[in-house]
Interface confidence: medium
Amino acid sequence: TPLGPKWPEPVFGRLASPGFPGEYANDQERRWTLTAPPGYRLRLYFTHFDLELSHLCEYDFVKLSSGAKVLATLCGQESTDTERAPGKDTFYSLGSSLDITFRSDYSNEKPFTGFEAFYAAEDIDECQVAPGEAPTCDHHCHNHLGGFYCSCRAGYVLHRNKRTCSALCSGQVFTQRSGELSSPEYPRPYPKLSSCTYSISLEEGFSVILDFVESFDVETHPETLCPYDFLKIQTDREEHGPFCGKTLPHRIETKSNTVTITFVTDESGDHTGWKIHYTSTAQPCPYPMAPPNGHVSPVQAKYILKDSFSIFCETGYELLQGHLPLKSFTAVCQKDGSWDRPMPACSIVDCGPPDDLPSGRVEYITGPGVTTYKAVIQYSCEETFYTMKVNDGKYVCEADGFWTSSKGEKSLPVCEPVCGLSARTTGGRIYGGQKAKPGDFPWQVLILGGTTAAGALLYDNWVLTAAHAVYEQKHDASALDIRMGTLKRLSPHYTQAWSEAVFIHEGYTHDAGFDNDIALIKLNNKVVINSNITPICLPRKEAESFMRTDDIGTASGWGLTQRGFLARNLMYVDIPIVDHQKCTAAYEKPPYPRGSVTANMLCAGLESGGKDSCRGDSGGALVFLDSETERWFVGGIVSWGSMNCGEAGQYGVYTKVINYIPWIENIISDF
């Protein structure tokens, strides 16, 4: 008869032999069935026990059973070799039910008082198992009142049997050319009740090779082929396996770019599994041979699908595909064993024919017409009238395809006209205007454009003149008629030049004195330099040492002569420099405004008069001989003077050119 309250009320109580604490009667049989809720067990212990002792408890006994299993058969008061009394032992049901049977036989030799026992239901800790028994759960076991549940580590899922953890081992796709894969947990035992699928998927053209490495241990059977756990390898062509046992399978050359590996395990066994190292191969491409003067990178034993190489040319050689230059070259091996691009050539860099040098020439040094890498050419300027500017003229064809000077310049050298050459041998005479002879003043420029003026040639495309002489034409430079290379003002034989632009000094104010009376005319073409057309030199820093008081300068021009007419033939006069204070004082008195002579001016002439420049000479150069370089340079520009040219006590006033060197250089370099 069931005892104890209905669930969920607590299950506990007391049992005792009939008549306890008095003696029990003969021929008694009593049975108690105790039932606990599922997930609980029953605990029973005795507080009193006194039964007749008999061999193997055959006469009187208390039997404890749980299900089909007898937990104990008890009799006597104390345990002997063959009989057991409960003593202080506690007894536990195996499940949630416990049967207690009390029996006494037909006689007792003396009175026995029987037994008293107490019971209670208690939670079973299913997570605790005896040593050597299988664990309740594969991974994690969680006990709770009335039961337990299992859970799994990351990467596993609980099987529908609620105890086994199946590996989440499907869907892995390997796309690298080589790699490793193994059974879950390898080299520890693989999980039970799992179905793993691994895919190797390479680009078409590759062939996967599988090597089983280290160890192989998959549950097997002596008679049946892999009935429990097995490994299968599937390609689009064939299936390999199933594999099991302890022997490493042989290498598998799949001849396929896609492989599916299936691993299935059952609910039992303890095996370490497998490990596969996979590689791939493909049809190699023809071995690349570097073109002459080039090299292949990287160098490999062979080149298969997707492998590539680049070609790099030696210095001085360039990549060419046919006739087309390439910045770089890389070829890729294709699945059919061919390269995607034909091999280029490394062709020697050719700088091409060197550019012609204005007023100069070029000579092939390496060999006639040789213009390839490391070839040398020599530029030189036309002798006498031109000189090479800051360059030795030697150019080498460099790897970048440019002719390059020893200083690394890629631009042409410049043939600058030689300045300050004159056929005149200076004399000491300082009186009387003289007729110029051919080559005496080859820098002399005649400027026609409303009035007659003069200028001096600088380099081969600039004219230095006075601002007041070209002021009216500053916005119409093309109106200036510029002539050179002639002595006769009216001669039809001259070299014509035209103006591209007129630059008047920003400090010059027209009709308000002659300070900063300086201008530059840029010619629209370079003039050819010869003995009759040669530029004047600009003064060196040291030039003032040749322009002290009483030093002789020479003015030239077609200006008014003593007869009051413009000169037909170019005239010149040698005149001394006048002390600046003396000159300033000469122009301090009326009709000249105070401050007419500035520090930007120099004066030249005779105190007694008679030697001077005059109207029509404006803009012309007052030149001096640099005795160190033996070249003539421009010290002054004919600017202004007394109303009456050559007047005693008055002097010709010239723009002091040395003060304007930075201005001149800036304009010429900017334009």
Epitope: C285, P286, P288, M289, D336, G337, S338, M343
Partner: antibody, heavy 125, light 107 residues
Framework: EVQLVESGGGLVQPGGSLRLSCAAS????????MAWVRQAPGKGLEWVAT????????YYRDSVKGRFTISRDNAKNSLYLQMNSLRAEDTAVYYC??????????????????WGQGTLVTVSS | EIVLTQSPATLSLSPGERATLSCRAS??????IHWYQQKPGQAPRLLIK???RSISGIPARFSGSGSGTDFTLTISSLEPEDFAVYYC?????????FGQGTKLEIK
């Protein structure tokens, strides 16, 4: 005069092995890539394998990869073809051939300029 | 792999006639096509290399042309000894392949 003489052919069971040899004379052997080309009875020509002049690289047709090995001994002017795991479809006359060392468009690629008389390999049970 | 297709499979002509044999590649092979002649019981013999380059010792009546995918072997005037099987071969890919052959027979 260029001469290539093959030997080592014969009857072999499926799965069996055979080693073919080719003795070369009359040219500078170590200047040439060498190849084996086969011809099944009544069928066309089929390239089998190539080895570069210095032995540094080998090339095989897919169906023989892993089963056949081409090698050479430049000191002995000899070319070899080791054939394992033979199949019925490997039955053919095997020709030893020089593969020209010329390279076109910058890659080693060859034509077969000199040929031996061939040796017959029969794979049958 | 690169597939070479030769046409016609058989060509019947008489001595003195002009023979034109065709070889078509499944993809461009530049000029990396070579032609061979094979007579019964003999090894093949190289006739033309790299589509059109002649081989010393080969009669001038043999010539080749083409590039890319279409190639032709021409025998200008057939001699009795020219009746044989002719093969083309590509070396553009390292996986060398031959055509299936054209049999040139006496008409």
């Amino acid at each position: 005069e260029v001469q290539l003489v093959e030997s080592g052919g014969g009857l072999v069971q499926p799965g069996g092995s055979l080693r073919l040899s080719c003795a070369a004379s009359g040219f500078t052997f170590n200047d040439y890539n060498m190849a084996w080309v086969r011809q099944a009875p009544g069928k066309g020509l089929e390239w089998v394998a190539t080895i570069l002049f210095d032995g540094s690289r080998t090339y095989y047709r897919d169906s023989v990869k892993g089963r056949f090995t081409i090698s050479r001994d430049n000191a002995k002017n000899s070319l070899y073809l080791q054939m394992n795991s033979l199949r019925a479809e490997d039955t053919a006359v095997y020709y030893c051939s020089t593969e020209s060392p010329y390279y076109s468009e910058g890659y080693y690629q060859g034509y077969f300029d000199y040929w031996g008389q061939g040796t017959l390999v029969t794979v049958s049970s | 792999e690169i597939v070479l297709t030769q046409s016609p499979a058989t060509l019947s002509l008489s001595p003195g006639e002009r023979a034109t044999l065709s070889c078509r590649a499944s993809q461009s092979v530049s000029t990396s096509i070579h032609w061979y002649q094979q007579k019964p019981g003999q090894a093949p013999r190289l006739l033309i290399k790299y589509a059109s380059r002649s081989i010393s010792g080969i009669p001038a009546r043999f010539s080749g042309s083409g590039s890319g995918t279409d190639f032709t072997l021409t025998i200008s005037s057939l001699e009795p000894e020219d009746f044989a099987v002719y093969y083309c071969q590509q070396s553009y890919s390292s996986l060398y392949t031959f055509g299936q052959g054209t049999k040139l027979e006496i008409k």
